[in-house]
């Protein structure tokens, strides 16, 4: 297992939201991406394929999500002060073989200016 | 270690229906694509079909769309062939195979089906 | 659907040979960096059992003297010094599309 902080910008504001970006190498075809809060799974979303090349796709802790050929965002809505917390992607590797575990992470710091109903 | 064990295999006549299972143990069955491929007496190895983790995709080979159903208990670790109209060509060991994300890693012993009146 | 072909059907071989056998793709199996192209063995009365992934990855336990090779639509599996037990059928399989198609097979007898 490799651990490690993000080398990119994990957290991204809009709307009282925030997206948090989980990257993989391009070479990745199925894999296993977890989004954990502390030691607990928030949201997952693994990408698997069939002896047909079929991708599947599934959830098992639903949360918004969205796919790209490098990376998985996952997105969290109604950000109060509570979600300040380290995030880490925890990335297992099905394919191309060897399986691997990668987890990277960082610190989500909230500020008043990204709360989504602040009080005037 | 994993184990795939079919049983259901048999005489049937030409027309007719039957049902072929395949226990799974010694991995977590709901984390793979699992597969039915087929071997008729003295000839090579054909795709039957494949489902994925959770059922909700299945796909077929041309030879058994819309005759053949495949599907799965993941409570029971069970993968199911349903096969129905069945014709003499369909004569053959059935194998379950699981999709090991890039190839087919682990294979039952297999069962027989033979299509006869 | 992608066929797939295999030369020889069969062949008699003896121990401490060098077999090849060959496999050829009607379209070529290369996707990114991977050719999805696949070696199972079976012999006589038993399950077929992975050898190759990948075109030339071998699988855990799979002794050295299997080698598989080749990229786009040509393949070849080598057994380096054959040995008894290693006679049964070969065959090659694609995993590129819907259907996965296998080879005809390669059966190695003894000579």
């Known amino acids: 297992e490799i651990n490690g902080s993000a080398n990119y910008e994990m957290f991204i504001f809009h709307n009282g939201g925030v997206q948090i970006l989980c990257k993989y190498p391009d070479i990745v075809q199925q894999f296993k991406m977890q989004l954990l809060k502390g030691g607990q799974i928030l949201c997952d979303l693994t990408k698997t394929k069939g002896s047909g090349n079929t991708v599947s796709i599934k959830s098992l802790k639903f949360c918004h999500s969205q796919l790209s050929n490098n990376s998985v965002s996952f997105f969290l809505y109604n950000l109060d002060h509570s979600h300040a917390n380290y995030y880490f992607c925890n990335l297992s590797i099905f394919d191309p073989p060897p399986f691997k575990v990668t987890l990277t992470g960082g610190y989500l710091h909230i500020y008043e200016s990204q709360l989504c109903c602040q009080l005037k | 270690e994993v184990q795939l064990v079919e049983s259901g295999g048999g005489l049937v006549k030409p027309g007719g229906s039957l049902k072929l299972s395949c226990a799974a143990s010694?991995?977590?069955?709901?984390?793979?694509?699992m597969d039915w491929v087929r071997q008729a007496p003295g000839k090579g190895l054909e795709w039957v079909g494949n489902i994925d983790e959770d059922g909700s995709i299945a796909e077929y080979s041309p030879f058994v769309k819309g005759r053949f159903t495949i599907s799965r208990d993941n409570v029971k670790n069970t993968l199911y062939l349903q096969m129905n109209s069945v014709k003499s060509e369909d004569t053959a060991t059935y194998y379950c195979?699981?999709?090991?994300?890039?190839?087919?890693?682990?294979w039952g012993q297999g069962t027989l089906v033979t299509v006869s009146s | 659907d992608i066929v797939m072909t295999q030369s020889p059907s069969s062949l008699a071989v003896s121990a401490g040979d060098r077999v090849t056998i060959n496999c050829k793709s009607s379209?070529?199996?290369?996707?990114?960096?991977?050719?999805?192209l696949t070696w199972y063995q079976q012999k006589t009365g038993q399950a077929p059992k992975l050898l190759i992934f990948?075109?030339?990855t071998r699988h855990t336990g799979v002794p050295d003297r299997f080698m598989g090779s080749g990229s786009g639509t040509d393949f070849t599996l080598t057994i380096n010094s054959f040995q008894t037990e290693d006679l049964g059928d070969y065959y090659c399989h694609h995993h590129y599309n819907a259907p996965p198609t296998f080879g005809p097979g390669t059966k190695l007898e003894l000579r």
């Open positions: 195979s699981r999709w090991g994300r890039f190839a087919f890693d682990s």
């Open positions: 379209q070529s199996l290369l996707s990114g960096s991977f050719n999805y």
């Open positions: 010694g991995f977590t069955f709901s984390d793979y694509w």
């Open positions: 990948y075109a030339s």
